[in-house]
């Protein structure tokens, strides 16, 4: 808190300008009128205030707007936004996409802070829905934001947004989310050639169906084990030993280390032991020679 002191003679601020950077904290408190500050917020960002000084300016706005700032002020907060707490932001009603963009710009290049997360939450709730323009904006600033959305919300993500996604941004996505994102990624990258396509699509393969994995196995992609282990179990099970060998290329040797983990474990149980032996990895647990395999799921579908 800044002590209440009278403004020294001749120092009363008539406008928000660069001369204020030389004011001490108590002088800013005493000499800057909160209403003047609110009407000239657009100037603050261009002035090299210290964060100590921004604290004082925030305090003045808090006194003027105890119920929360109006959007006309919020849009021009600039670096002052970094001084806001999630509690402050929960009092706001942000409806303009321009306001959202302006505040996200301040935090650009940095991790999503609690302030930003709260702002986004307030914005989406204020709009009532997560429309395409909002998603475009959010995924442009925070590609990792995708994994915080429900599958239903993800269904409205435009494929064009997928281009901004980095592999690490999908680390927290679960299979249900990848099921929605994979077809969008496939569409987004469809015009790329084989090797380039695989580099881009690799992070999304946790949502790929069997037929796409079979197609990839014909393209010498050399999928690494980390990617293979994230594939859907139901998509891996129908793959033959030959297809998995082609899919993994030189990485096929890594299957031995993962033979007790899904989806490798479940896949081994579905393969003929003879076929597994051709890999020369000592994988055990396949269907013994001479046993007949009945695909009951196919039988049920026919009846």
């Amino acid at each position: 808190e800044v002590e209440k002191t009278a403004c020294p003679s001749g120092k009363k601020a008539r406008e928000i300008d660069e001369s204020l950077i030389f004011y001490k904290k108590w002088e800013l408190e005493a000499c800057v009128d909160a209403a003047l500050l609110a009407t000239q917020m657009d100037r603050v960002n261009a002035i090299p205030f210290t964060y100590e000084q921004l604290d004082v300016l925030k305090h003045k706005l808090d006194e003027l707007y105890p119920q929360g700032y109006p959007e006309s002020v919020i849009q021009h907060l600039g670096y002052l936004f970094l001084k806001m707490s999630p509690e402050d932001i929960r009092k706001w009603n942000v409806t303009s996409l321009e306001t959202l963009k302006a505040l996200l710009e301040v935090n650009k290049g940095h991790e999503m802070s609690p302030q930003v997360a709260t702002l986004i939450d307030r914005f989406v709730k204020g709009r009532g829905q997560l429309d395409k323009d909002t998603l475009d904006t959010l995924t442009a600033f925070y590609p990792g934001y995708l994994c915080s959305l429900s599958p239903e919300e993800l269904s409205s993500v435009p494929p064009s947004s997928i281009w901004a996604v980095r592999p690490q941004d999908l680390d927290t996505c679960d299979p249900r989310q990848l099921d929605v994102l994979y077809p969008k990624a496939r569409l987004a990258f469809q015009n790329m050639n084989g090797s380039e396509y695989f580099v881009k699509i690799q992070s999304f393969l946790g949502g790929a169906p069997t037929e796409d994995l079979k197609a990839l196995s014909q393209q010498n992609v050399s999928m690494d084990l980390a990617t293979f282990m994230k594939l859907r179990t139901d998509a891996v099970l129908p793959l033959t030993v030959a297809e998995v060998q082609k899919l993994l290329g030189p990485h096929v040797e890594g299957l031995k280390a993962e033979e007790r983990h899904r989806p490798v474990r479940d896949w081994i149980l579905r393969q003929r032991q003879d076929d597994l032996d051709t890999l020369g990895l000592g994988l055990q647990g396949g269907i013994p020679n001479g046993y007949l395999v009945l695909d009951l799921s196919m039988q049920e579908a026919l009846s």
């Epitope: 090299p48 205030f49 210290t50 964060y51 100590e52 670096y79 970094l82 001084k83 935090n107 940095h110």
Partner: nanobody
Framework: EVQLVESGGGLIQPGGSLRLSCAAS????????MGWHRQAPGKERELVST???????YYANFVKGRFTISRDNSKNTLYLQMNSLRAEDTAVYYC?????????WGQGTLVTVSS
């Protein structure tokens, strides 16, 4: 985090010159602007000069025409050239970097102007 280390202070006669340096390290890409502040014995700390990332400079009235702030991006160093020094310039001079999302301060360097 940004680390700042000042140097160049010392005892100087009135009318003399000194050049202060401030070496910055750490996350310097997050710095928005830098400045020199000073604190004389028994007084509040006050801003002397500021320079922005685009090179715009600002000076307090009490040093205008005598002090010059500059920086060398290749060396990540901020400077304050102080000419025509007066007894009232005696203070501890602090380097400050305003970076995302806080102010970082050096430990200060003492400048004593005395005959």
């Amino acid at each position: 985090e940004v680390q700042l280390v000042e140097s160049g202070g010392g005892l100087i006669q009135p009318g003399g010159s000194l050049r202060l340096s401030c070496a910055a390290s750490g996350n310097i890409g997050s710095i928005r602007h830098m400045g020199w502040h000073r604190q004389a014995p028994g007084k509040e700390r006050e801003l002397v000069s500021t320079i922005t990332t685009v090179g715009t400079t600002y000076y307090a009235n009490f040093v205008k025409g005598r002090f010059t702030i500059s920086r060398d991006n290749s060396k990540n160093t901020l400077y304050l050239q102080m000419n025509s020094l007066r007894a009232e310039d005696t203070a501890v001079y602090y380097c400050r970097a305003t970076a995302h999302p806080t102010d970082y301060w050096g430990q200060g360097t003492l400048v004593t102007v005395s005959s």
